[in-house]
Structure formats: C-alpha cells, structure tokens
C-alpha cells in the first residue's frame, strides 16, 4: 500500500503528461486524480512510465473500480495490461473486438499468457461462439490458438467461421481436435469445385473417415505424403493399394521412405503383398500371397 | 516545419522582471513541452525549466523562486517570467522543444535565441 | 541536482583526426524506467545549439555517421571519427533523466 500523503503545492497534475515520469510513487498517489487518468487513459501508453509508477496507477484505478474496469478504460489500458491478473481480468465485460485486438497487440510476439488466456477466455464467452472475426483476430496473433481449445470448446465454433482458419493454424491440432474441426470445414466447404476444395480441406483431413478419404481418391487430388502422414491410421487401414494409390497419385512414390511410419506401416500390414508389388516401390510387410485374412473384429460384432 | 521563436524586451533594468515569449509553429503545444534554456555571453547552457503537454512546470533549483513558465496552447504560444534581475543575468535566452515520444526527453529543435542584456 | 563533469574543457585537433570527448554524471542516469536519458548537442560558433545524440548513442536525423555515442550509468562519450571544419563548435552532455535537467560545461572543439 501506497502511503496517503498530500500532494505537494503546483504538482497536482492537471493532465497525464509525460512530466509524470519525474513523480516519486507517492506523489503519483497524491497527485494523479483517478478519474482523471480514467479519462485519459490513451495517454498512458505514451509515456515512458516505470513499472512502480505502473503499479502506482493500477492501483488507483483498482480503487475507483473495485467491480472490475469499464471497456472504455480497458481498452485504452496499453502496456498497463501487463500489470493485471487474471484474476483483475476475470471481473471485466469485455464486448469489443478492437478492445480485445488493442490487448492482444500489448502482448504481441510474447507466449500466450494467462491474462491473455483469461482475457480470451471471457470474451469468446461473451460472445456465446466463436465466429469468424474472433478467430480471424486470435488466429493472428496466436497461430496455435485453435489447437490450444479442447474438443468441447470447439464444438462451439461455427462452420462459418473455419474460413478464417489457415493452415498453419492447425499444426499443433491433435486427432480429436481435427475430428472436431473436420466436419465443420467439409461443411463449410462444400459449394467448392474439387481442386478448391481438395486446397482448403487438405489441413483438416487429419480428421476424415474412410468413406471421405475412398471418395477424395476418385478426385485425383494428388495429396502430399505429408499430409497423407497425419491421416487417421483406423481411417487409412482400410483403405485398398489402388485407392492410396489414386489418392497420392505421383506422390505414391514417397510410401517407401515412410514405410516405417504409421499410418503407412500399419496399412501395409493390411494389404496383400501382391498389391503392394503393383506399385513398384519394393514395399515390404503385406500379407502373404495363399494367406486368408480373418476380421476378427466384425466376428466379434456378429458374435 | 517546426520552428520556435524568440521575442524579448533587449534590455532590462536591475531588478525588473523580464519576460520572453516562446512563438512555434509545425506542432502543437498539446503535443510537445517546451524547455527555456539560457547562455550567458562566452559561458555554457544553463536550463531553466520545462512546461509540460498538461500545463505542468518544473525549474532550475536555483532560480525557481524567481521564475514562472506559461503557455497559451491556442496561440502555439510559451511565455518565461522571471523577476529580480541582476547584471549576471544577462544573457541569451532560447526556447526549445523537448521531445518525449521518439527522442525520449531531448530538446531537438530549438529557436535562435534573444538576446537580454542587464544593464542601468 | 545532477552535475554533468565534461573533459576536456577544450579539444584541439587535426582535421581527419579522431576526438573523443568524456562526460560524466554525479548520479547514474539511468531512470526507473530503463532508459537513459543521456544527449549530446553542438553549438557552432553564431548559431543555437542543435540536437546530434540522445539517448546516449541514437543519431538524430541528419547527424552523419562519424558521430557516435557510447557509455553507460554515468559515464558517457561522444567520438567523432574523421573531424571536419564543420564539427568545430562547442560540444554540450546534458541529462534529462532527473528534474531539473541539467547540461555538462562545455568542449570546445578546434583546429590545432
């Protein structure tokens, strides 16, 4: 706590200028009116101000708004936001797009921190969903931001709003999330032609079923093995040589480099070997030609 | 662009009051401070003081008792007092903008400066 | 209030020389804030000073690049590379990290 003490004579201050970084902290106390740097608050961010002075002026609007800052403080609060908690951010009603956009941008090129979690966290709520804009605004500024929602949250997002999703946004999405966000997109995406769509799908096919990833090989789609990596490894499997095949199309030659890998291991675990040799690429693992293949897990079904 | 003018009486008498008017122009004065800066002839720079974008003022230790600085921001005005003159007074007096944005506090334009002898 | 030492109080050098001229605080400038409010300025014989550093090694714009600055706390210098006619002045530190701001003596830079 600040002790109370009476501004000495000629320096209380008339405006927030930048004669208030001369101020000792006790005279910020006494001579700084709070509702005079409530109303000026866009001037703060100018001024060269120490982290104790911060501290000094936070607390003051803390005092003349116990119940938490009105927009049109938070708004114009700059660098002052780092000086708040989450727990200061929880008592806010953050509506504005550009308030949340003149925030983020005080934390630009900095980790998402929990006043900034926090700060979006209330927001998005506010909102009810997450559309477009707002994830236009925080994809920017936090390309991993999607992926950093649980599966819950993101059933919240609209179809809509996946066009504001780019692909580098979803790099750090695991299964569960792209099952989410996969649906939405292909709905989202669905008055396009084939090689338009195949382009803005592509990203999400992490969480595609078979049925889509049999039909998308119809469509000579000339996928990337890197994307054809981070498929579902149960939506691969029962995919035949011929559709992979289809479905990579000049890529198909990459499969031996990852033979190794899932999903593409697993799913030569699963074809004849003699499939496997049309292609040409020496791929080795396949079932041996004579062998009879049981799917024990539909027998379990029947059974 | 940015200009500051000096205007001055020349000559004062011992122990009258001088005052000095500061006129600039290519900036506002609710943008930027402006300091008064003074040289005596053949001698350094002495500052005298400063008036801030909000109207706030501070002085030279040793002349404060002596010294007042107003400005008319509608005018691109800035006004020096200062009372009780003696001979080691005179001087050369310049005003000069502080800039506290991107030169953080340096006094980048300054005017010519005018010139106040002390004398009976 | 702070007092700004400059050394020496006067420079005689040869053209295309290099000068160097120190300054030096009672206090530490660096504010709060991190910032250290440090600047340089020349004064040519007739004229009103002009702003060439602040900020302790920041040109300020027009000032050519044999002009530098370099220092820290309270300890500053200003280095001209190759001195030219033109740079012959006096030379001012001055401080506006404390109130009152405060400026050093002066060095007066000559041809020797």
């Known amino acids: 706590e600040v002790e109370k003490t009476a501004c000495p004579s000629g320096k209380k201050a008339r405006e927030i200028d930048e004669s208030l970084i001369f101020y000792k902290k006790w005279e910020l106390e006494a001579c700084v009116d709070a509702a005079l740097l409530a109303t000026q608050m866009d001037r703060v961010n100018a001024i060269p101000f120490t982290y104790e002075q911060l501290d000094v002026l936070k607390h003051k609007l803390d005092e003349l708004y116990p119940q938490g800052y009105p927009e049109s403080v938070i708004q114009h609060l700059g660098y002052l936001f780092l000086k708040m908690s989450p727990e200061d951010i929880r008592k806010w009603n953050v509506t504005s797009l550009e308030t949340l956009k003149a925030l983020l941008e005080v934390n630009k090129g900095h980790e998402m921190s929990p006043q900034v979690a926090t700060l979006i966290d209330r927001f998005v709520k506010g909102r009810g969903q997450l559309d477009k804009d707002t994830l236009d605004t925080l994809t920017a500024f936090y390309p991993g931001y999607l992926c950093s929602l649980s599966p819950e949250e993101l059933s919240s997002v609209p179809p809509s709003s996946i066009w504001a999703v780019r692909p580098q946004d979803l790099d750090t999405c695991d299964p569960r999330q792209l099952d989410v966000l996969y649906p939405k997109a292909r709905l989202a995406f669905q008055n396009m032609n084939g090689s338009e769509y195949f382009v803005k799908i592509q990203s999400f096919l992490g969480g595609a079923p078979t049925e889509d990833l049999k039909a998308l090989s119809q469509q000579n789609v000339s996928m990337d093995l890197a994307t054809f990596m981070k498929l579902r490894t149960d939506a691969v499997l029962p995919l035949t040589v011929a559709e992979v095949q289809k479905l990579l199309g000049p890529h198909v030659e990459g499969l031996k480099a990852e033979e190794r890998h899932r999903p593409v291991r697993d799913w030569i675990l699963r074809q004849r070997q003699d499939d496997l040799d049309t292609l040409g690429l020496g791929l080795q693992g396949g079932i041996p030609n004579g062998y009879l293949v049981l799917d024990l897990s539909m027998q379990e079904a029947l059974s | 662009q940015v200009q500051l003018k000096e205007s001055g009486p020349g000559l004062v008498a011992p122990s009258q009051s001088l005052s000095i008017t500061c006129t600039v122009s290519g900036f506002s004065l609710s943008s930027y401070a402006i300091s008064w800066v003074r040289q005596p002839p053949g001698k350094g720079l002495e500052w005298l003081g400063v008036?801030?974008?909000?109207?706030?003022?501070n002085y030279n230790s040793a002349l404060k008792s002596r010294l007042s600085i107003s400005k008319d921001n509608s005018k691109s005005q800035v006004f020096l007092k200062m009372n009780s003159l003696q001979t080691d007074d005179t001087a050369r007096f310049y005003c000069?903008?502080?800039?506290?944005?991107?030169?953080?506090?340096?006094?980048?334009?300054w005017g010519q400066g005018t010139s106040v002898t002390v004398s009976s | 209030d702070v007092v700004m030492t400059q050394t020496p109080l006067s420079l005689p050098v040869s053209l295309g020389d290099q000068a160097s001229i120190s300054c030096r605080s009672s206090?530490?400038?660096?504010?709060?804030?991190?910032?250290?409010?440090l600047h340089w300025y020349l004064q040519k014989p007739g004229q009103s000073p002009k702003l060439l550093i602040y900020?302790?090694?920041n040109r300020f714009s027009g000032v050519p690049d044999r002009f530098s600055g370099s220092g820290s706390g309270t300890d500053f210098t200003l280095k001209i590379s190759r001195v030219e006619t033109e740079d012959l002045g006096v030379y001012f530190c001055s401080q506006s990290t404390h109130v009152p701001f405060t400026f050093g003596s002066g060095t007066k830079l000559e041809i020797k």
């Open positions: 000069a903008r502080n800039n506290y944005g991107r030169l953080d506090y340096a006094m980048d334009y």
């Open positions: 008036i801030w974008t909000g109207g706030g003022t």
């Open positions: 206090q530490s400038l660096v504010h709060g804030n991190g910032n250290t409010y």
């Open positions: 900020k302790v090694s």
